[in-house]
């Protein structure tokens, strides 16, 4: 028969008491060996009953050098089946075997879940020599059992290439349930339900879960593991754990957070990086995100302007980085600039608004009547032209640019001259003679240079030529006009 | 389906003692706890406690203590409700209801009326 | 305890009419559960949780609130919803039903 030895059930129905064939204890095996050296009685590991017939592994000696007779089969006594204690305690077990004392190097190994037990495991075999057989006692001891020492411990043991293997040793370690899955943090939409998942393990079986909601029960009664909780919506953010529950006691989950998605916090700190005639630099920080991530971003520009509409300019953009060059400006002009962000919910409200403004623009106009002519005396080339009509924004003028090429036998020279902004007229040097002078004129001011005048171009001739006419800026439409003298 | 079904009408002299039946049926009788909620004439839903029918432990509310007890009888999955002593202003319609998450009664007995009088 | 406050007690509409009950509780609630009685019956689940509607009930009713808060709305009233509604708090111990609001035909 099997040996068994067990607690009296407990009559709480919830959680089943030990399997039969099965030892429950928080205390070191009663059918262990004390650590002590000497003669232990075998009788402490094999029931004093004739053991029922063995199934499992057995040597079968041959006949002895007498040949008179046959020696019985070789098998592991039984033992106790099943162990449960729980965590932290510390259990000793053991089997044993009478071996005939025909055999020599006898060794036992310890296996757990069909692997071997090497190394630092607390392993001891003792052997008592009688005149025709050994007995063999190996006993396997844990110190604080824990859960990874669950398992199915067999010996095993070697005689002429022969394999003997005793009845398994279930050990069962039992304590607090174990969560393998807890409730996650979450962002949630408003009123829209969601779920939340708890499950734990024991042993002991069964685990059952109790969910909690800002410190309230949510289920008035235990809901086996895995358990799954639908949340009917929520409305503020909430804070949600699980409890666990078994024979031994309670486990109580990380408490997570679960926040309701709302629109985003205004962006702060909106500041100017660079301005220019038609351009800003914009950069902000982003508010609050709103348990959502930013999908983009809003600049709004207004024109500060009493005579201005009141327009709303909107450039939308990516989210990150947060900046924005804002373009399509009018040069020295002022704006109020604001940003607002969006996630998933909606729109931020808008940021504080802030002025920024435009620098000087450059001419938007070249100057006019652009007229050249060579004055053969002084060998140089007298130019005219009339001030453009720039607008306020453009700025004050504060000069002209004049572009010079001289073009002569495939070779061409590109010069430049800068001119005070009361000119209205200059003179060049002839840089080459019996070549080509086109002049082109553009007007100057802090925000630029503006675009420059149609081409006029004039024949500079060899030496001893009379200058006659002039060139000048051709009307719209016409060819440019060389004039030779 | 769920169902509960609630003992008969029951009319007592005062002092006397009086046993309220709730027979449940159409789901695992363990897996939910039972609520007992009092109306009296006239008046609105008054709740007295409720039995969990997982450990047996009962649960009532201020005022329902003492004279009132909440008990079950799994195999048959039934909760009980007595009330002993019986006073006059104990006259009302009592009333079982089967209790989900968040206390939600999704089920409720059809009532059993109590009318106590000399 | 957490006492709930149903207001108005007595709502008179006629067919056709939009109700809105209203229930407020004596400190934060999460949850607030509404039920139908009819005479000589038993309570009929109505909203659970806030704002669900419980299995069979018409998509005229409706459910709202939170923290201190909570409404029931009838967007059309039927004859059949003339009865007496009662909300019910679930957030602490004990389980608290406020005192109803009986919708009656004007």
């Known amino acids: 028969a099997i040996t068994e030895a067990r607690e009296e059930a407990k009559p709480y129905p919830l959680f089943p008491g030990p399997l039969p064939g099965s030892l429950q204890t928080d205390h070191t095996s009663l059918l262990s060996l004390p650590h002590t050296s000497g003669y232990q009685p075998a009788l402490m590991f094999s029931p004093t009953q004739p053991g029922r017939p063995y199934t499992g592994n057995v040597a079968i000696p041959r006949v002895t050098s007498a040949g008179s007779k046959l020696l019985p089969p070789l098998a592991f006594k039984h033992t106790v089946g099943h162990i449960i204690l729980s965590e932290h305690k510390d259990v000793k077990f053991n089997c044993s075997i009478s071996v005939p004392n025909i055999y020599q190097d006898t060794t036992i190994s310890w296996w757990k879940d069909g692997k071997e037990l090497l190394g630092a495991h607390h392993a001891i075999t003792q052997f008592y020599p009688d005149d025709e057989v050994t007995a063999i006692i190996a006993s396997f001891s844990i110190t604080s059992v824990q859960r990874s020492d669950n398992g199915s411990y067999i010996c095993k043991m070697k005689i002429n290439n022969e394999e003997i293997v005793s009845d398994p040793i279930y050990i069962e370690v039992q304590g607090l349930p174990h969560f393998t899955k807890q409730p996650e943090s979450m962002n949630v939409t408003r009123n829209t339900a969601f779920n939340l998942t708890c499950q734990a393990v024991g042993p002991p079986e069964p685990v059952n879960i109790f969910w909690v909601q800002n410190s309230s029960r949510v289920n008035e009664q235990p809901e086996k593991s895995p358990s799954v909780l639908t949340v009917p919506g929520l409305t503020e953010m909430a804070v949600f754990s699980c409890e666990a529950h078994n024979d031994k006691g309670l486990t109580v989950s990380k408490g997570v957070q679960i926040n309701i998605k709302a629109i985003p916090s205004p962006p702060t700190e909106v500041s100017i990086h660079n301005s220019t005639a038609h351009s800003i630099l914009i950069s902000w920080v982003p508010g609050f995100d709103g348990y959502s991530p930013f999908r983009n971003c809003s600049v709004q520009v207004k024109e500060v302007d009493p005579l201005s509409n009141g327009s709303v300019m909107i450039f939308n953009t990516s989210a990150s980085p947060h900046m924005y060059q804002i373009k399509q400006l009018q040069a020295l002009a002022n704006y109020s600039i604001g940003v607002s962000c969006m996630n998933e919910i909606g729109w931020s409200a808008v940021s504080p608004w802030i002025l920024a403004s435009t620098t000087e623009g450059a001419p938007s106009v070249a100057p006019l009547n652009v007229t050249v002519f060579l004055n053969e005396s002084r060998d140089n080339v007298d130019i005219r032209w009339m001030k453009p009509l720039t607008k306020r924004q453009a700025g004050e003028l504060v000069g002209y640019r004049i572009s010079h090429v001289w073009q002569s036998a495939g070779i061409s020279k590109e010069l430049l001259e800068e001119v005070g902004q009361n000119n209205s007229r200059a003179q060049i040097s002839v840089q080459v003679h019996n070549a080509t002078c086109t002049v082109r004129i553009a007007a100057v001011t802090k925000g630029g240079v503006g675009p420059f005048s149609d081409p006029v171009k004039i024949f500079i001739p060899a030496h001893g030529w009379v200058d006659h006419a002039p060139s000048s800026t051709p009307a719209p439409g016409n060819a440019d006009p060389v004039l030779i003298i | 389906q769920v169902q509960l079904v609630q003992s008969g009408s029951e009319l007592k002299k005062p002092g006397a003692s009086v046993k309220v039946s709730c027979k449940a049926s159409g789901y695992t009788f363990t897996n939910y706890g039972v609520h007992w909620v009092r109306q009296a004439p006239g008046q609105g839903l008054e709740w007295m406690g409720w039995?969990?029918?997982?450990?047996?432990?009962?649960t009532y509310a201020q005022g329902f203590t003492g004279r009132f007890v909440f008990s079950l009888d799994t195999s048959v999955s039934t909760a009980y409700l007595q009330i002993s002593s019986l006073k006059a202003e104990d006259t009302a319609v009592y009333y079982c209801?089967?209790?989900?998450?968040?206390?939600?009664?999704?089920?409720w007995g059809q009532g059993t009326l109590v009318t106590v009088s000399s | 305890e957490i006492v709930l406050t149903q207001s108005p007690a007595t709502l008179s509409l006629s067919p056709g009419e939009r109700a809105t009950l209203s229930c407020r509780a004596s400190?934060?609630?999460?949850?607030m559960h509404w039920y139908q009685q009819k005479p000589g019956q038993a309570p009929r689940p109505l909203i659970y949780?806030?704002?669900n509607l419980a299995s069979g009930i018409p998509a005229r009713f409706s459910g709202s609130g939170s923290g201190t808060s909570y409404t029931l709305t009838i967007s059309s009233l039927e004859p059949e919803d003339f009865a007496v509604y009662y909300c019910?708090?679930?957030?602490?111990?004990?389980?608290?039903f406020g005192g109803g609001t009986k919708v009656e035909i004007k």
């Open positions: 019910q708090q679930w957030s602490s111990n004990p389980r608290t």
């Open positions: 400190s934060s609630v999460s949850y």
């Open positions: 209801a089967r209790g989900n998450r968040y206390a939600y009664m999704d089920y």
């Open positions: 949780a806030t704002s």
């Open positions: 039995g969990n029918t997982y450990t047996g432990e009962p």
